[in-house]
């Protein structure tokens, strides 16, 4: 009945106006629809311009909905990252504060004369944790070498120790084990603990980064057409009350988000690996136990050096010759009191357990984020019909939606009736993000085995995939030691969402 409400375009007028468009475009009554390029060409309340405006609007609305969903996930990952990062940094800072508070009393000048070396060690550990491409074992070895050189001079102020003698001392050091078992123990435990902590936090950063970048991938023109048809063609065709059929909506969004769904497998792998590596946070080589107790290993090392002084000196003289005695120099340093050791195992504070259980639950919740996205957006954003009945909008008219729902991912869209998807042309941004997920998963798996992927031999088992250098966003820096000739810079990108802290000022 041309005189009925739906034929008069009143409802369309209301909806169109509410979206901020000019009402002068809207016909008073239905017109012939041969001009329509997206909606079925029956009688319509939409002009060409209206159709174009609504197509652009539906496209923007879907992109906004997509970004909103991504933002919620990003915010969760960023909160997790910040919480874990704060906790791990707090553990290390606590250890350094304890060292600064207790070592002067425990070791006197053996500490105060070497305060800078200890500060440097903590700075290097901090840099390593924050993603700097430095070799932790090498860093620790250099620290012990420098410390031995300095302490040996302090313990023998009566000896003239020129640089060549100190070089000889350095060469002897490994065989002499001047600091007892502490360096070896710290190396083994710290490597595992720091690798686990940093790779977990990096994993959160990479996941967040992937979500952010994927949310910026534009929806193609075929998707725009399909979404317009899904959301606004019912209005144009005079059935504005008809809500989209659920399966119809799913097919449209599965077509639109086909590339995003291809993230699913590697996304799950990453989250699984992250959940798995939290096992490494506990026990005697666990993150909390080790990172919070670096100072106790250092104390143990200095005590061992004092205990072994005479034997060590004899062996050094045997290997490097008799150093000249300075006639003006004082006698050998008196044996100092042993530095009292705090218990090596930090009692767990409970903070990390709480963080881990929350993280595990949240990571499990978002495991199927990419494949559930079409369903989520349909149910939350598209005002679907409550049932697949014959009263819902099926893209052509009110009625049942008959096609089957497509599978997930690009390959499964070959016969998608709603969106023309070229399955031979995957989105390159999303492929790159899949690669980033693979690289990070590979890092986490290596970290689980106690290895730092940045410094594994090229003669690895060949498994895994990725760029081969474990670097993200092509922001690699080079490893360095005093013996090599390159430079080292922190990879701030390794923890997206955290800016690199500047070097500390002290006075």
């Amino acid at each position: 009945d041309p005189a009925s409400k739906s034929r008069s375009c009143g409802e369309v007028r209301q909806i169109y106006g509410a979206k901020g468009f000019s009402l002068s475009d809207v016909p008073q009554a239905e017109i012939s629809g041969e001009h329509l390029r997206i909606c079925p060409q029956g009688y319509t309340c939409c002009t060409s311009e209206m159709e174009e405006n609504l197509a652009n609007r539906s496209h923007a609305e879907l992109e906004t909905a997509l970004r909103d969903s991504s933002r919620v996930l990003q915010a969760m990952l960023a909160t997790q990252l910040r919480s874990f990062d704060d906790h791990f940094q707090h553990l290390l800072n606590d250890s350094e504060r304890t060292l600064q508070a207790t070592f002067p009393g425990a070791f006197g000048e053996l500490y105060t004369q070497n305060a800078r070396a200890f500060r440097d060690l903590y700075s290097e550990l901090r840099l390593y944790y924050r993603g700097a491409n430095l070799h932790l074992e090498e860093t620790l070895a250099e620290f012990w070498a420098r410390l031995l050189e300095r302490l040996f001079k302090q313990l023998h102020p009566q000896l003239l120790l020129p640089d060549d003698y100190l070089d000889c001392l350095g060469k002897q050091a490994e065989a002499l084990r001047p600091f007892g078992e502490a360096p070896r123990e710290l190396r083994l435990r710290a490597t595992r603990a720091f690798v686990a902590a940093r790779s977990f936090v990096q994993g959160l950063g990479v996941a967040s980064d992937v979500v952010r970048k994927v949310a910026q991938v534009p929806l193609g023109p075929e998707c725009s057409r399909a979404v317009m048809k899904l959301v606004y063609c019912a209005h144009c065709l005079g059935v504005p009350g008809a809500r989209p059929c659920p399966d119809y909506c799913r097919n449209v969004l599965k077509g639109c988000l086909a590339n995003q769904a291809d993230l699913d497998a590697e996304w799950r792998n990453l989250l699984d690996s992250m959940v798995l590596i939290t096992d490494k946070f506990w026990g005697t080589s666990g993150v909390e136990s080790v990172i919070g107790s670096v100072h106790t290993w250092l104390a143990e090392a200095i005590n061992a050096l004092q205990d072994n002084r005479d034997t060590l000196t004899a062996k050094v003289i045997q290997g490097c010759g008799n150093p000249k005695v300075n006639p003006q120099g004082p006698g050998p340093e008196e044996k100092r009191r042993r530095g009292k050791l705090a218990p090596r195992e930090r009692p767990p504070s409970g903070t990390l357990e709480k963080l881990v259980s929350e993280a595990k639950a949240q990571l499990r919740d978002v495991q199927d984020f990419w494949i559930s996205l079409p369903g989520t957006l349909c149910s939350e954003k598209m005002a679907l019909s409550t049932a697949s009945d014959d009263r819902c909008w099926n893209g052509m008219a009110r009625g049942r939606y008959l096609p089957e729902v497509m599978g997930d991912g690009l390959a499964n869209q070959i016969n998608n009736p709603e969106v023309e998807v070229d399955i031979t042309k995957p989105d390159m941004t999303i492929r790159q993000q899949i690669m980033q997920l693979k690289i990070m998963t590979n890092r986490l798996r290596s970290a689980y085995n106690g290895n730092d992927v940045d410094f594994q031999d090229a003669s690895d088992d060949g498994s895994g995939s990725g760029s081969g250098d474990g670097c993200l966003d092509d922001l690699c820096s080079r490893k360095v030691s005093r013996k090599s000739s390159s430079s080292r810079t922190p990879l701030t990108h390794a923890l997206p969402g955290l800016s690199e802290q500047e070097g500390q000022k002290t006075s």
């Epitope: 290097e124 840099l127 640089d163 005093r482």
Partner: antibody, heavy 119, light 108 residues
């Protein structure tokens, strides 16, 4: 061989800032601390502070702490010393100096940069 | 801060003679003392570290010694090129390294 090459002489007005650079070569840049020492005309040497090129950590002489900033660029093996709120008594030759080994002994020196502060 | 006091302010010695320069620390700096030589218009040059160890390439006529907080730089058989200002520096008190005010050595 170890070389430290500093930027050229500067003339500044009181209240301004100056940034002096020191480019290192001939050794592993990140392996040794770099220090800045200044010498006013006809005066002695005064230690201003140090930077660890590996970590960026800095330690400043209390006297300059509010006005000095030391930074480094590992990609170019260069350290920088910026002094702000200049006054006439900051007129001096500014030297960068590299430690001998991990010890606070200045074995290698730049050629010096004369900074003149004058209105 | 550790104050380093050098004496004399100026020392005038004939060539071939021995010059003895002194440096006193206001508190113990162990043997962590270095000596530098500075010629006009040049950067300082390291001579001695560890109070008595000669730096690489420094001739044997330069020697250092110490007793307690008193440090001495001795230049034997002086040559005209030894004319310079000599500074002592303590590096015991990190992070407050301090220099003496310098001794000007003139060759008569």
């Amino acid at each position: 061989q170890v070389q430290l090459v500093q930027s050229g002489a500067e003339v500044k007005k009181p209240g301004a800032s100056v940034k002096v650079s020191c480019k290192a070569s001939g050794y592993t840049f990140t392996g040794y601390y770099m220090h800045w020492v200044r010498q006013a005309p006809g005066q002695g040497l005064e230690w201003m502070g140090e930077i660890n090129p590996s970590t960026g950590d800095t330690t400043y002489n209390q006297k300059f702490k509010a006005r000095v900033t030391m930074t480094r660029d590992t990609s170019t093996s260069t350290v920088y010393m910026e002094l702000s709120s200049l006054r006439s008594e900051d007129t001096a030759v500014y030297y960068c100096a590299r430690e001998k080994r991990d010890d606070g002994v200045f074995a290698y020196w730049g050629q010096g940069t004369l900074v003149t502060v004058s209105s | 801060d550790v104050v380093m006091t050098q004496s004399p302010a100026t020392l005038s010695v004939p060539p071939g003679d021995r010059a003895t320069l002194s440096c006193r620390a206001s508190q113990s700096v162990s043997s962590r003392l270095a000596w530098y030589q500075q010629k006009p218009g040049q950067a300082p040059k390291l001579l001695i570290y560890g109070a008595s160890t000669r730096a690489t390439g420094i001739p044997a006529r330069f020697s250092g010694s110490w007793s307690g907080t008193e440090f001495t730089l001795t230049v034997s058989s002086l040559q005209s090129e030894d004319s310079a200002v000599y500074y002592c520096q303590q590096y015991n008190d990190w992070p407050r390294y301090t220099f003496g005010q310098g001794t000007k050595l003139e060759i008569k």
